[in-house]
Interface confidence: medium
């Protein structure tokens, strides 16, 4: 979380954003708010990103401002025109690129004053691992399959009988470029399993950190995955 | 198009003001800082400060404190530098500079100001 | 103040081939967030500077990728993979972690 005031004491408004994540040919949220002004006409939102010339969005007078908008971010960005109000100024980022990343300001400038505040964004692929008994292996053997990954994650498999144990002599991982050449499919095999434990699949890059659990028991298998994005801090 | 454009050349005696104007296009002025930038011929570069140009407060330099002014006119998107009590090495190009984050990343043309008798 | 020195002074170069320029400052350029304020410029002649690359290693927009920067604390590289015409001018390094923000005394490239 990263808090801003105005640099200016008498007119300085706090603004917070937190840091996040995009995923690559999805919609991504930059998250900004401020203290609500109570005439739309009065708020200002700029937002701006570091290594660029152009506005990434503007917004005044209740409505979009994008005369000064840079080309690589025509047409895919547009802010909450109805949270405004409330003091909500994020921005949608549609089609997330690889090249998003980096730092952005959010600018804010209501009749109380001004302030702004700085968001990392980073930008890649993360997907939720599935694990799965691999029946047509000669063994007793797991496959954790996730079909989106950028950049290169590591792939880690533990076990919840054997806490502590390396995996990494009994388990094989590879990574297959996708069609679009960017994001790559992991998949990892682990070898060897035993019955009535419970095997974990973290796969983890400096964006996400996923996990695929698979319980094998002799009367059942069951199967949880989750995702965490690893960078949302506030500021 | 983001640009700035600077005033011309000026020609001072010893001991008299110069003022200097940026005038910014292509962006929400009070957006970013506004620098300027001292160039000596055949000389490096020396910050001389710069100016809040949403508050209008200035930082200068230490070597500059004193004898700078710079002020700004958000009506005209235009940024001044005044520098007073003038001496020949003063003799140098001055450059407008947008601060994005922490780097300068427009600059002006530069303005050549020559101090001479 | 941070003195920033530059070295060399003056590099001929040939067409298509590399070169590097290297930067110092008399105290570490890490800033208590982490970030490290150095960033490079170039001056053609008879032209304003402009930002090449900043934060140490990141480049400008438009700026072409046989530019790259390196370092850490006081110590830092700015490298042209294979130089063309129009890299010919005055390179500065410059930094912004500490006010003043100082630059070097610049490197004049030059064709052979």
């Known amino acids: 979380l990263i808090i801003g005031f105005g640099i200016s004491g008498r007119h300085s408004i706090t603004v917070t954003t937190v840091a996040s994540a995009g995923n690559i040919g999805e919609d991504g949220i930059l998250s900004c708010t401020f203290e609500p002004d109570i005439k739309l006409s009065d708020i200002v939102i700029q937002w701006l990103k570091e290594g660029v010339i152009g506005l990434v969005h503007e917004f005044k007078e209740g409505k979009d401002e994008l005369s000064e908008q840079d080309e690589m971010f025509r047409g895919r960005t547009a802010v909450f025109a109805d949270q405004v109000i409330v003091g909500n100024a994020s921005l949608r980022l549609k089609n997330v690129q690889l090249t998003d990343a980096g730092t952005y300001k959010c600018y804010i400038i209501t009749s109380k004053g001004k302030g702004n505040a700085n968001l990392e964004y980073k930008t890649g692929a993360f997907s939720m691992p599935e694990v799965n008994v691999d029946y047509n292996a000669s063994s007793e053997t797991l496959r954790c399959e996730a079909p989106r990954w950028f950049p290169q994650p590591t792939v880690v498999w533990a076990s919840q009988v054997d806490q502590g144990a390396n995996f990494s002599e009994v388990s094989n991982t590879s990574f297959e470029l996708n069609s679009e050449n960017v994001t790559m499919k992991v998949v990892s095999v682990l070898y060897n399993v035993t019955i009535n434990n419970t095997y974990s699949c973290m796969i983890e890059n400096d964006i996400a950190k996923a996990t695929g659990d698979i319980k094998v028991t002799e009367s059942e298998i069951k199967r949880r995955s989750h995702l965490q994005l690893l960078n949302s801090k506030a500021s | 198009q983001v640009q700035l454009v600077q005033s011309g050349a000026e020609v001072k005696k010893p001991g008299a003001s110069v003022k200097v104007s940026c005038k910014a296009s292509?962006?929400?002025?009070?957006?970013?800082?506004m620098n300027w930038v001292k160039q000596a011929p055949g000389q490096g570069l020396e910050w001389m400060g710069w100016?809040?140009?949403?508050?209008?407060?200035?930082t200068y330099a230490d070597d500059f404190k004193g004898r700078v002014t710079m002020t700004r006119d958000t009506s005209i998107s235009t940024a001044y530098m005044e520098l007073s009590r003038l001496r020949s090495d003063d003799t140098a190009v001055y450059f407008c500079?947008?601060?994005?984050?922490?780097?300068?990343?427009?600059w002006g043309a530069g303005t050549t100001v020559t101090v001479s008798s | 103040d941070v003195v920033m020195t530059q070295s060399p002074l003056s590099l001929p170069v040939t067409l298509g081939q590399p070169a590097s320029i290297s930067c110092r400052s008399s105290?570490?350029?890490?800033?208590?967030?982490?970030?490290?304020?150095l960033h490079w410029y170039l001056q053609r002649p008879g032209q304003s500077p402009r930002l090449l690359i900043y934060?140490?290693?990141n480049r400008f927009s438009g700026v072409p990728d046989r530019f790259s920067g390196s370092g850490s604390g006081t110590d830092f590289t700015l490298k042209i993979s294979r130089v063309e015409a129009e890299d010919v001018g005055v390179y500065f390094c410059?930094?912004?972690?500490?006010?003043?923000?100082?630059f070097g005394g610049g490197t004049k490239v030059e064709i052979k």
């Open positions: 500079a947008r601060r994005s984050f922490w780097y300068f990343d427009v």
């Open positions: 292509g962006y929400p002025f009070t957006t970013y800082g």
């Open positions: 100016i809040d140009t949403y508050s209008g407060v200035p």
């Open positions: 105290q570490s350029l890490v800033h208590s967030n982490a970030n490290t304020y």
């Open positions: 934060k140490v290693s």
């Open positions: 410059s930094q912004s972690t500490h006010v003043p923000w100082t």
